[in-house]
């Protein structure tokens, strides 16, 4: 079938990086600058993506592949193929409609993107809080007091449940 198709359609012989030029008797012509064809047998080349404004070029457009964009410092990619750039926030913050806001008590964000997430509730796993949580870091859970044999550890038991480091009940 492939052989038959090739005989019938000369365009099928045009490799990626070219297009089948009807104006030149269906000869395979190279994609012009700022265009590409990622598959063979194409009758047109696609226009290359332009990485402008908040986008910056990660990789140039070649004859066979589109340009790849990234975001300028202070922004990060969202969506397939970095279709959008979203403003970075500091650790301990999340992006809202009004800009970057600190994480509420009992939540944290250890990245420059994404939302604030609740601290881990150590007691749900029968554990105790080893290190208190902050806006930037989750709590660190340790073994439950019952697991500690006398003299096995010098870890001080956590303060009452209202102290930072516990998720709201």
């Amino acid at each position: 079938f492939e052989r038959t198709r090739s005989l019938q359609d000369p365009c099928s012989n045009c490799p990626a990086g070219t297009f089948c030029d009807n104006n030149r008797n269906q000869i395979c012509s190279p994609c012009p600058p700022n265009s590409f064809s990622s598959a063979g047998g194409q009758r047109t080349c696609d226009i290359c993506r332009q990485c402008k404004g908040v986008f910056r070029t990660r990789k140039e457009c070649s004859s066979t592949s589109n340009a790849e964009c990234d975001c300028t410092p202070g922004f990060h990619c969202l969506g397939a193929g970095c279709s959008m750039c979203e403003q970075d926030c500091k650790q301990g913050q999340e992006l809202t409609k009004k800009g970057c806001k600190d994480c509420c008590f009992g939540t944290f964000n250890d990245q420059k993107r994404g939302i604030c997430r609740p601290w881990t509730n150590c007691s749900l796993d029968g554990k105790s809080v080893l290190v208190n949580g902050t806006k930037e870091r989750d709590v660190v859970c340790g073994p439950s007091p019952a697991d500690l044999s006398p003299g096995a550890s010098s870890v001080t038991p956590p303060a009452p449940a209202r102290e930072p480091g516990h998720s709201p009940q």
Epitope: A16, G17, T18, R56, T57, K59, S62
Partner: antibody, heavy 118, light 112 residues
Framework: EVQLVESGGGLVQPGGSLRLSCAAS????????MIWVRQAPGKGLEYIGF???????YYASSAKGRFTISRDNSKNTLYLQMNSLRAEDTAVYYC????????????WGQGTLVTVSS | DVVMTQSPSSVSASVGDRVTITCQAS??????LAWYQQKPGKAPKLLIY???TLASGVPSRFSGSGSGTDFTLTISSLQPEDFATYYC??????????????FGGGTKVEIK
């Protein structure tokens, strides 16, 4: 006038380091792919690598690890840091600007000679 | 690596001759190929890129063609200033930010 002027070449001992500079005038380097190419005496051209308009660097496999390309936008200057130099690194080093958003060099400097010898 | 094989390595020709230089890539590079001219003691000059696009200021007697692995530079009517060495160059991206932007070995066009 649109031009590139390389400097920093000279004699260096094997194992030594050298930093080449390429001063651009008439255009801003952070809007282009900026490229380093070298040519050993009497030999052909060898592509070293480039820094693109987004600030990302790419290197030929032979240059990766020993050579580092950087730029100073405020000085409109391109750099090539070369470490652990060997006799076979002796060459004329050219900086160049890419054409039309690509890494094909179209505007070239005059070149600077680096000689690695004891 | 992408290996670019240029032929012939040298050619003797006269003014007015039609000269053809070929370049073969070890793997398909689409139409990501350029041609350069270099004269002794001078920096190279870009003639053609994207296999067939004439660079700014380059005379129309220079033309490029080909795609995939096989490419050709043609000088339709050789002029005295065309005696020089010609190089092809691929653009090809590998993985881990490594590039195979490889030059061919060169073709020296000499006076017959």
């Amino acid at each position: 006038e649109v031009q590139l002027v390389e400097s920093g070449g000279g004699l260096v001992q094997p194992g030594g380091s050298l930093r080449l500079s390429c001063a651009a005038s008439g255009f801003t380097i952070n809007s282009y792919h900026m490229i380093w190419v070298r040519q050993a005496p009497g030999k052909g051209l060898e592509y070293i690598g480039f820094i693109n308009d987004g600030g990302f660097t790419y290197y030929a496999s032979s240059a990766k690890g020993r050579f580092t390309i950087s730029r100073d936008n405020s000085k409109n200057t391109l750099y090539l840091q070369m470490n652990s130099l060997r006799a076979e690194d002796t060459a004329v080093y050219y900086c160049a600007r890419g054409v039309d958003g690509t890494s094909y060099p179209d505007l070239w400097g005059q070149g600077t000679l680096v000689t690695v010898s004891s | 690596d992408v290996v670019m094989t240029q032929s012939p390595s040298s050619v003797s020709a006269s003014v007015g001759d039609r000269v053809t230089i070929t370049c073969q890539a070890s793997q398909s590079i689409g139409s990501d190929l350029a041609w350069y001219q270099q004269k002794p003691g001078k920096a190279p000059k870009l003639l053609i890129y994207r296999a067939s696009t004439l660079a700014s200021g380059v005379p129309s007697r220079f033309s490029g063609s080909g795609s995939g692995t096989d490419f050709t530079l043609t000088i339709s009517s050789l002029q005295p200033e065309d005696f020089a060495t010609y190089y092809c160059q691929s653009i090809y991206y590998g993985s881990d930010d490594v590039i195979y932007h490889t030059f061919g070995g060169g073709t020296k066009v000499e006076i017959k």
